[in-house]
């Protein structure tokens, strides 16, 4: 009669490498008497005998994973016990190897020149695949504008016309290579002013010719605006050559004015515009004109149309080359980001941003912008948009938007004048103010924002007021 013998594992488990969808086997040879009971665990969790993904044979000494999955990675142990002595255990790792697979391939992209393009290419594989990109027939070389991100995506900063073309991503590891399908990057060129009209300081009754040239695909059209209205007098001559339009406006000067050249072209259903302005001043007014950092004009844009007071004069900052266009572009860039913020933050932020970027203006001899009152800025920053503002400050940006977006500057509340010191020195935001006659919901700014989805703010109920709180920073 055989003597009882405690189990001994004669073939310890080893690390097994396996490809996805292949078979992987662990061998656990055991000597003992009587015959041991052998159980298997994965990551310390018992593998059930009836689990159809596994086959356990040879009295439990052979564990086979019938079709390896990515999630089967882990430590597998066999435990043998026959009641004589203690149970014995041996463990080994399963490393799932996987040929490269592109899980999120790139897609066709249309992008405006100067913006940032990101072509996605998310991959799977073990070992982790390296990702490279091909443009046309050549490997794409990275530079200060073009980078392959950690995720595999291709990021192109400041997209140029020459970036247009066909791209594909390539994922490669020791087991193989995967290619995405070819995708097209199309670069659209918005209307752009090549030569802005020049400002003139002339004597009363002079003739002046203002010249404006613009480029774009398709060729833009040019129109002229005088002090916010269509030009009422003067003659216009135009010529087009190599996608460049040249427009000349001849004027007889009897009063000073602000003349804006507007270049427009169409991209699908959307229009792009570029603006450039020039002042024509009469000689004896020149000193006061020089002191001005900008000019007052009616707001003619779209984004802030429902937020700003109707027909109000707003300040356009001439430190921008094309003030009206630049300020409208800034607010336009930000607008879509506001869709992501909370329902109380959004209308408050819209009111703040529009009134900060297009400040109320006192024309006078030197046009003067009127900043927002500190109390209203703080209401947005600390009450209505606290989460968004904190996230923004956490990224050390001064804007309401996520890192990587075109950041719109927001005012530094602490530097703004208080309405309690001098109520005439700053602008109140009616949307954040208490006025009994106010409407009860915010007006719909764009068709993508129905008024039914805009909640009340203090402005809009008869219950609230920005109050004289004096403990300000």
């Amino acid at each position: 009669e055989k003597l009882p013998k405690a189990p001994v594992i004669t073939t310890p488990l080893e690390t097994v490498d396996a490809l996805v969808e292949e078979v992987a086997t662990f061998m656990c040879a055991v000597e003992s008497y009587p015959q041991p009971e052998i159980s298997w665990t994965r990551n310390k969790i018992l593998i059930k005998l009836f689990d159809t993904r596994y086959s356990i044979r040879e009295n439990g000494q052979l564990l086979t994973i019938l079709s390896v999955e990515d999630s089967d990675d882990g430590i597998y142990c066999c435990i043998a016990n026959n009641g004589v002595g203690g149970a014995v255990e041996s463990c080994g790792a399963l490393q799932v190897k996987m040929k490269p697979k592109i899980t999120r391939p790139p897609i066709n992209v249309k992008i405006i020149e100067g913006l940032k393009a990101v072509l996605p290419c998310t991959t799977m594989g073990n070992p982790k695949p390296s990702v490279s990109w091909i443009k046309g027939d050549n490997a794409l070389r990275e530079n200060s504008r073009i980078a392959v991100l950690e995720s595999g995506s291709l990021r192109i900063h400041n997209v140029q016309k020459e970036d247009a073309g066909q791209y594909r991503c390539v994922a490669k590891n020791s087991l193989g290579t995967a290619y995405s399908k070819l995708v097209k990057l199309e670069v659209e060129v918005f209307a752009r002013i090549l030569r802005a009209p020049e400002s003139h300081n002339v004597t009363f009754g002079s003739f002046v010719t203002l010249r404006c040239t613009a480029i774009g695909i398709p060729v833009p059209t040019i129109s002229w605006i005088e002090n916010g209205n269509a030009v009422s007098s003067g003659s216009i001559q135009e010529s087009v050559k190599d996608r460049v339009i040249d427009s000349r406006l001849q004027l007889f000067i009897t009063k000073p004015g602000l003349y804006t050249c507007i270049a427009t072209n169409k991209h699908g259903e959307k229009f792009s515009t570029a603006k450039a302005a020039a002042t024509v001043s009469i000689a004896e007014w020149s000193k006061s004109q020089k002191d001005s950092q900008g000019y007052c004009a009616q707001y003619r844009g779209e984004v802030c149309d429902a937020v700003l007071a109707k027909d109000a004069l707003v300040f356009f900052n001439t430190s921008y080359r094309d003030p009206e266009d630049a300020q409208e572009l800034l607010i336009h860039t930000a607008w879509n980001e506001l869709k992501a913020v909370s329902p109380l933050c959004r209308p408050a932020a819209e009111a703040l941003l529009c009134n900060h970027l297009f400040q109320e203006c006192s024309p006078g001899v030197v046009p003067t912008p009127m900043p927002i009152c500190r109390e209203y800025c703080l209401a947005v920053k600390e009450l209505f948009c606290a989460k968004e503002w904190q996230a923004m400050e956490g990224k050390a940006h001064r804007g309401l938007y996520r890192s990587g977006m075109h950041l719109l500057p927001v005012p530094e509340c602490s530097k703004l004048p208080s309405m309690h010191r001098d109520p005439t020195a700053c602008t109140r935001l009616p949307y954040l103010d208490y006025k009994k006659e106010n409407i009860t919901t915010f007006p719909s700014i764009t068709s993508s924002r129905p008024s039914a989805d805009i909640p009340n703010l203090p402005a809009s109920t008869s219950s609230f007021a920005v109050s004289p709180a004096y403990s300000m920073t």
Epitope: P343, L344, L378, A386, Q390, P455, L457, T461, A469
Partner: antibody, heavy 119, light 113 residues
């Protein structure tokens, strides 16, 4: 320990004044917007006022506007409610509450202080 | 202002049984841009201040037992206590924070039968 502790309640005649205080501890007081919420005896909750973290912006319910003033002293971690021209309908337990960052629900409440306006 | 209406005003439930409280808002508190409902639930035990239970209509505040759950969207919401315990005797309030001013329901008193 995160807590709010109100004080300053009591009996006052109609037309009189009272100043409530709320001492905060255990959280960053100067970055938290704070509110007062009241509860008349046997009744529900009514929001009264809010003040931003810096104290630079305040809002009031219509029922108290003009005779209540909310303020704060961040150096003392203390919130105040100055109540003037008190009326019988201002009788209530006044709770100080911390407003959730960016949203207008209240994640921390004090135990409350009773204000009774009666002649 | 958005008006919040709770039903019933009071209910008596046996220990271990389910308690259901309803809350209706006079206008939707669902914000379509982020698909969130701006609604909170509070518990006020006798002689105690209110305590936040649930926000975003269904997210439990940390430390709140999982027998409390919130559901609903738009204008109709429910607070459910799946198995009533003795310590759940309290008044429960709903509150909208979709628009200013924040407004509360009139409260629902929960007692043991």
């Amino acid at each position: 320990e995160v807590q709010l502790l109100e004080s300053g309640g009591g009996l006052v005649q109609p037309g009189g004044s009272l100043r409530l205080s709320c001492a905060a501890s255990g959280f960053t007081f100067n970055s938290s917007a704070m509110s007062w919420v009241r509860q008349a005896p046997g009744k529900g909750l009514e929001w009264v006022s809010v003040i931003s973290g810096s104290g630079g912006s305040t809002y009031y319910a219509d029922s108290v506007k003009g005779h209540f003033t909310i303020s704060r002293d961040n150096s003392k971690n203390t919130l105040y409610l100055q109540m003037n021209s008190l009326r019988a309908e201002d009788t209530a337990v006044y709770y100080c509450a911390k407003k959730e960052l960016g949203d207008w629900y209240f994640d921390l409440w004090g135990r409350g202080t009773l204000v009774t306006v009666s002649s | 202002d958005i008006v919040m209406t709770q039903s019933p005003d009071s209910l008596a439930v046996s220990l271990g049984e389910r308690a259901t409280i309803n809350c209706k808002s006079s206008q939707s508190v669902l914000y379509s841009s982020n698909n969130k409902n701006y609604l909170a639930w509070y518990q006020q035990r006798p002689g105690q201040p209110p305590k936040l239970l649930i926000y975003w209509a269904s997210t439990r505040e940390s430390g709140v037992p999982d027998r409390f759950s919130g559901s609903g969207s738009g204008t109709d919401f429910t607070l459910t206590i799946s198995s009533l315990q003795a310590e759940d005797v309290a008044i429960y309030y709903c509150q909208q924070y979709y628009s200013i001013p924040p407004t509360f329901g009139q409260g629902t008193k929960v007692e043991i039968k």
